[in-house]
């Protein structure tokens, strides 16, 4: 996160850290807890690393430096990448992770509400992006979970800023015209959440941007409301009956 500040304990209890353990262990992506056994993240996090066994998912944590070999983590039972996601395109950058064992909810570890299907009428004015990603383009992973308040921008405006790309209706953009605040490398898959009528909702999944926090280059997020049918289909068919945080 560029231009952000430190988060507090329990402020974003749905935020998880997706880490890979090969020779060393490192944080690669963020994700959002959406049910006892489900995490929503970006499909591109798994490019080149589709093996379930190498991943460790840490929930209920604030500081990555607090993780030791004794820190509990979740393992992956199943990775469900959107069937239309292609490595050669930037569309449908969404994936579900089914955890091997369900998580108990606590003050520091609980799910985010999902939006209503095809939610286009709600005007979100209080949106935040969180993650442990770089604090500048050529930076490094941060220890303490960062947060930043960023306004949504229209898809029309976003398309003007990204003429070389196709900004679809299944994407949502956020950023300041002058730049300075944005997600960055390592924040991928994490949440863009907006507070509406006193409730936090998962509006976007951190997907991509041209650099980080550059002027007139908003961040682009996968629009969760556009994938509600897919999310419900996959979680219910896998679970029988999904333990989901119901759409608001």
């Amino acid at each position: 996160i560029v231009g952000g500040t430190n988060s507090s304990w329990g402020e974003w209890p749905w935020q998880v850290s997706l880490q890979v353990k090969l020779t060393a262990q490192r944080h690669l992506c963020g994700g959002s807890l959406i049910g006892h056994q489900w995490v929503l993240t970006a499909a591109h996090c798994f490019d080149g690393l589709p093996l379930q066994d190498v991943w460790r998912i840490y929930s209920g944590i604030l500081n990555l430096s607090d993780i030791t070999k004794d820190t509990p983590f979740s393992q992956i039972k199943e990775i469900i990448i959107h069937q239309n996601y292609k490595v050669s395109e930037g569309n449908h950058d969404i994936a579900l992770i089914k955890l091997q064992a369900p998580l108990n909810y606590t003050e520091f570890q609980k799910p985010i509400c999902l939006p209503s299907k095809g939610d286009t009428s709600t005007i979100y004015t209080n949106c935040w992006v969180t993650g442990w990603g770089f604090s500048k383009e050529k930076g490094e992973i941060q220890n303490i979970l960062q947060k930043v308040n960023i306004p949504l921008v229209t898809n029309e405006e976003c398309q003007k800023r990204y003429q070389d790309y196709k900004i679809t209706q299944r994407m949502v953009c956020a950023g300041y015209k002058e730049g300075g605040k944005d997600a960055c490398k390592g924040d991928s898959g994490g949440p863009l959440v907006c507070k509406h009528n006193g409730m936090w909702r998962l509006v976007g999944i951190t997907s991509w941007g041209e650099g980080c926090a550059r002027r007139e280059q908003p961040g682009v997020y996968t629009k969760v409301a556009e994938y509600m049918d897919w999310i419900l289909e996959k979680t219910q068919s896998s679970d029988g009956k999904a333990q989901m945080q119901s759409p608001a």
Partner: antibody, heavy 125, light 108 residues
């Protein structure tokens, strides 16, 4: 299966014009940036131009700027290169290529993942 | 413009040997925008590596890419007869997009 098929090459006199076409199939053409690359006989590869998915944004190499025009017709899945004021140094095999733009570590990637077989343009009197 | 300089110009090796090809850029290039292509006589180029180190679909694992910033490398761990060709690096980090001049890998 992704396929790109160029046509329109041939022999043309200096100062003349030629229009190359590239017929695309096997993918959603309107989602992809497309590019032209050329290769003079016995030489290396030279990027010529690219066009955005909508066709609203185009960029050219300095060597062809003002003489060549790239365009596309998404309804026909076809890419074009209009070449005017041709010179001897434009003699080359012209390839069209699809520009893949995936995502890695919250940044976009960019590379030419599929190429046509090429069409030869010879500029000579 | 960003100039890509490949070395050596020609590499003479025998099948089974290891080939190391270098590509240096005149300015910083984001790894995501660095690719390697193989070209055989009379054929169109073929994508080998994208994002500096990711193998394209169907490319054997004897091909690997590495590097960052201004220094990139393509390695062929054990040359097969079909690997003798010309190899190009290419950047699309900034326009004009540019290619290296190529490295020819020939049979010794």
């Amino acid at each position: 299966e992704v396929q790109l098929l160029e046509s329109g090459g041939g022999l043309v006199q200096p100062g003349g014009s030629l229009r190359l076409s590239c017929a695309a199939s096997g993918f959603t053409f309107s989602h992809y940036l497309m590019t032209w690359v050329r290769q003079a006989p016995g030489k290396g590869l030279e990027w010529v131009s690219y066009i955005s998915p909508s066709g609203g944004h185009t960029i050219y190499a300095d060597s062809v700027k003002g003489r060549f025009t790239i365009s596309r017709d998404n309804s026909k899945n076809t890419l074009y290169l209009q070449m005017n004021s041709l010179r001897a140094e434009d003699t080359a095999v012209y390839y069209c290529a699809r520009v893949a733009r995936g995502i890695a570590a919250r940044s976009r990637t960019s590379y030419f993942d599929y190429w046509g077989q090429g069409t030869l343009v010879t500029v000579s009197s | 413009e960003i100039v890509l300089t490949q070395s050596p110009g020609t590499l003479s090796l025998s099948p089974g040997e290891r080939a190391t090809l270098s590509c240096r850029t005149s300015q910083f290039v984001n790894s995501n925008y660095l690719a390697w292509y193989q070209q055989k006589p009379g054929q169109a180029p073929r994508l080998l590596i994208y994002g500096a180190s990711s193998r394209a679909t169907g490319i054997p694992d004897r091909f690997s890419g590495s590097g960052s910033g201004t220094d990139f490398t393509l390695t062929i761990s054990r040359l097969e007869p079909e690997d003798f060709a010309v190899y190009y690096c290419q950047q699309s980090s900034r326009t004009p997009w540019t290619f290296g001049q190529g490295t020819k890998v020939e049979i010794k």
